[in-house]
């Protein structure tokens, strides 16, 4: 059986939309599937790599690599999206390409970044971990770390940094899929909202879905002990 909830929820474009949340009900009347997984049920994607989930994550990363920051022209906010999802008339799509990107580093002026921009994250304004010396952030936003400390400045002069961010990574469903969404939408969908991250590639949704002890390598499920727990 399925339990359907419908509600008006604030979505990425800043408007309220009617959203359906479909929950698979437990036939025996008890915890939901997500709760059972958290309690240690035999759920194979938490025990070993699942090809379907792995391909989903890779597909999400490929899309994210090509994303940019969509900044609303009315200064109502910004969100990481694909170009096709960013209004050409109502918003500005900030995406580095060809020669428009910043240099990889102050020591390497010739090599320009082509991957980015990212809403609320920039190697030029992140103090921790700083992109410098042997630790220059790669020209692939899906390999960027979470910035834990921004440079202390009210404004940077960068469109993608001075906007109000409207969406962050949200882990939805038992398949460990990730979407950049508003907090409201994420909570309605019973997802896990990552306030600290800017990109889906910075979070490991399956690790969150599985719970219990975190994976040794967040990319590799290793909870073999589930076989004995249940």
């Amino acid at each position: 059986a399925q339990h359907v909830t419908t509600q008006l929820v604030l979505r990425n474009k800043g408007v309220y939309e009617s959203v359906k949340y479909i929950q698979q009900e437990n036939f025996w009347i008890g915890p939901s599937s997500i709760d059972l997984i958290h309690l240690g049920a035999k759920f194979s994607p938490c025990i070993r790599k699942d090809q379907q989930i792995e391909q989903l994550v890779l597909r999400e990363r490929d899309l994210e690599r090509d994303s940019g920051c969509c900044v609303q022209n009315d200064h109502s906010g910004c969100i990481q999206t694909q170009r096709k999802d960013c209004s050409e008339t109502l918003a500005t799509f900030v995406k580095w390409q060809d020669d428009t990107g910043p240099p990889m580093d102050k020591s390497d002026l010739g090599q320009k970044r082509t991957s980015g921009a990212v809403c609320h994250q920039d190697p030029r304004t992140c103090e921790e971990p700083a992109s410098s010396g042997a630790h220059i952030w790669p020209d692939d936003i899906t390999k960027w770390p979470i910035c834990t400390e921004q440079a202390k400045s009210n404004r940077t002069g960068f469109l993608h940094m001075d906007c109000q961010i409207k969406g962050r990574p949200c882990c939805i469903s038992t398949k460990g899929s990730c979407e950049i969404t508003t907090r409201e939408y994420c909570e309605f969908m019973h997802g896990y909202f990552h306030e600290e991250a800017t990109l889906c590639s910075q979070v490991h949704c399956l690790d969150k879905v599985c719970g219990l002890l975190p994976f040794l390598n967040p990319e590799v499920p290793d909870q073999f002990y589930r076989l004995w727990l249940s």
Epitope: D99, P103, K106, A130, S132, A151, G157, F158
Partner: antibody, heavy 123, light 106 residues
């Protein structure tokens, strides 16, 4: 308000070493992303970049003069010092220090300059 | 080193005129920066990243260009605009400036 002021000898003899100090206020060179550079201008001629130093102590020099230049900073005193060895009459110029900014820029630029100090090299 | 050649080296114009100064780089660069210098004074940044107006700079100043050719335009000359203008690149070390364009009153 950001200000920078250059100080040093007005006259130096050929072969001597010139030491210039840039004292600044209104910003800190320990702040992430900040830098201070030196630029000179011989009388009636164009500007020439000499060197600059960043908050993380990374230093960059004009390769044509690199062997003669040393730049350093004293964050606690809000000072940047440039030394030029083996001075020659062709080094006669007004020496400027300037703050490096990247506000809104994919690169950086010299956004606030000192008033400059004229150094004459003569025996 | 990337060489920047400005043209003209000097030019005479009248208040209200539209003036264009060009800067040609010896090799392709991504962005150009422009500075204004008045006699006995330090330079002042006008334009960064080719076309962005620095803080406090009047909107009659504009910049454009790409590759190796860049221009600074003053749409309607004002008495305070008579000065020397320099282009500068930050695309490769050593950082270089153009030789300057002196703008004089006709």
């Amino acid at each position: 308000q950001v200000t920078l002021r250059e100080s040093g000898p007005a006259l130096v003899k050929p072969t001597q070493t010139l030491t210039l100090t840039c004292t600044f206020s209104g910003f800190s060179l320990s702040t992430f992303g900040r830098g201070v550079g030196w630029i000179r201008q011989p009388p009636g001629k164009a500007l020439e970049w000499l060197a600059h130093i960043w908050w993380d102590d990374e230093k960059y020099y004009n390769s044509a003069l690199k062997s003669r230049l040393t730049i350093s900073k004293d964050t606690s005193k809000n000072q940047v010092v440039l030394t030029i060895t083996n001075m020659d009459p062709v080094d006669t110029a007004t020496y400027y220090c300037a703050r490096i900014q990247n506000y809104g820029s994919n690169y950086w630029y010299f956004d606030v300059w000192g008033q400059g100090t004229l150094v004459t090299v003569s025996s | 080193a990337i060489q920047l050649t400005q043209s003209p080296s000097s030019l005479s114009a009248s208040v209200g005129d539209r003036v264009t100064i060009t800067c040609r780089a010896s090799s392709r660069i991504s962005y150009m920066f422009w500075y204004q210098q008045k006699p006995g004074k330090a330079p002042k940044v006008l334009i960064y990243d080719t076309s962005n107006l620095a803080s406090g700079v009047p909107s009659r100043f504009s910049g454009s260009g790409s590759g190796t050719d860049y221009t600074l335009t003053i749409s309607s000359l004002q008495p305070e605009d008579f000065a020397t203008y320099y282009c500068q690149q930050w695309n490769a070390y050593p950082l270089t400036f153009g030789q300057g364009t002196k703008l004089e009153i006709k």
